[in-house]
């Protein structure tokens, strides 16, 4: 059973979220479960390091984008939120908290100003930002 959930503060339009846990989960209480991932959007603004610590304290990590298909609800996310992508100055690459490298063609990331951390925005966009800038953030937990 699927329900059209309109989470006005999070998404630009209706997002299909499964109602029953048999399709997805388990997830922490009040988190969004979608295609075997648990997501939570946190409204308080923190810098990247504080956001990472907050997610870790809940046995989660900052958002990792790995699949446009499995994470299609992210297309519609409103505003800008810290995700778990960071710049590694030693080799110039961008990688996720788990050490994996950013896959090509998953995100269109623009560096409008110098920075080593990245914000997620709608339509699989990313914005590079100074890590010390306060922003809201998305935590994610894999269920499988």
């Amino acid at each position: 059973i699927w329900s059209a959930v309109f989470l006005n503060s999070l998404f630009n339009q209706e997002v299909q979220i499964p109602l029953t846990e048999s399709y997805c989960g388990p997830c922490p209480k009040n988190w969004i479960c979608y295609k075997n991932n648990c997501y939570q959007f946190f409204d308080e603004s923190k810098n990247w390091y504080e956001s990472q610590a907050s997610c870790m304290s809940q046995n989660a990590s900052l958002l990792k984008v790995y699949s446009k298909e499995d994470q299609d609800l992210l297309k519609l996310v409103k505003s800008y939120h810290w995700m778990g992508l960071v710049h590694i100055p030693t080799n110039g690459s961008w990688q996720w908290e788990d050490g994996s490298i950013l896959s090509p063609n998953l995100l269109t990331i623009i560096e409008m100003q110098k920075g080593d951390c990245a914000l997620y925005a709608s339509s699989f966009k990313g914005y590079i930002e100074n890590c010390s800038t306060p922003n809201t953030y998305i935590c994610m937990q894999r269920t499988v």
């Epitope: 110039g92 690459s93 961008w94 950013l102 090509p104 063609n105 269109t108 990331i109 623009i110 560096e111 409008m112 100003q113 110098k114 925005a121 709608s122 339509s123 699989f124 966009k125 590079i128």
Partner: antibody, heavy 123, light 107 residues
């Protein structure tokens, strides 16, 4: 081959509206950002703003915020720059360009440019 | 916004000579600076990005150096086609900005 082809020169009167275009080809239009730069007669270059054609997310330089509108139609790979009420001071050459991708990240330089559209505003 | 000041305004040199163009930023832009060449009636062309990287197809006689606030574009031996206006541009902070340009003219 990446190409950006701009619409032709325009001569307008003050107060008139105008929309100029920049047709992009030879690459995935929705994987890059496109921008506009102004060059007034005999002067240097000024960033106006940039747009992500995937969802029309737009960023304007403060000097141009509210003065122009940047838009894009991803179905025809075209970016636009428009004015609702032209002034004589809008007389300039306008260039569109594609932002560079370096190590998978879009960075703030134009690697490809349109040929320019000359806009003349005079009564 | 970050102001870029280029010097000199005009550089008069002969073919085969070395050209040294300067760009100074009002605050640090790290290495986030590019150089463009513009010939009369043409769009600019990206020469150097992020201070020292040559863009695709740019001859080796063009080189860039510097970081922080002081940058240099060097043309090791001027060819006839190099006489043009050169602009620097920073992308360290939005709005991105250009310098006012240096004209390299034939002496």
């Amino acid at each position: 081959e990446v190409q950006l082809v701009q619409s032709g020169a325009e001569v307008k009167e003050p107060g008139e509206s105008l929309k100029i275009s920049c047709k992009n080809s030879g690459y995935s239009f929705t994987n890059y950002w496109v921008g506009w730069v102004r060059q007034m007669p005999g002067k240097g270059l000024e960033w106006m703003g940039i747009i992500y054609p995937g969802d029309s997310d737009t960023r304007y330089s403060p000097s141009f915020q509210g003065q122009v509108t940047i838009s894009a139609d991803k179905s025809i790979n075209t970016a636009y720059l428009q004015w609702s009420s032209l002034k004589a001071s809008d007389t300039a050459m306008y260039y569109c360009g594609r932002l560079t991708m370096f190590r998978g990240i879009i960075i703030g330089y134009f690697d490809y440019w349109g040929q320019g559209t000359l806009v003349t505003v005079s009564s | 916004e970050i102001v870029l000041t280029q010097s000199p305004a005009t550089l008069s040199l002969s073919p085969g000579e070395r050209a040294t163009l300067s760009c100074r930023a009002s605050q640090s832009v790290s290495s986030y600076l590019a150089w463009y060449q513009q010939k009369p009636g043409q769009a600019p062309r990206l020469l150097i990005y992020d201070a020292s990287n040559r863009a695709t197809g740019i001859p080796a006689r063009f080189s860039g150096s510097g970081s922080g606030t002081d940058f240099t574009l060097t043309i090791s031996s001027l060819e006839p086609e190099d006489f043009a206006v050169y602009y620097c541009q920073q992308r360290s902070n939005w709005p991105w900005t250009f310098g006012q340009g240096t004209k390299v003219e034939i002496k």
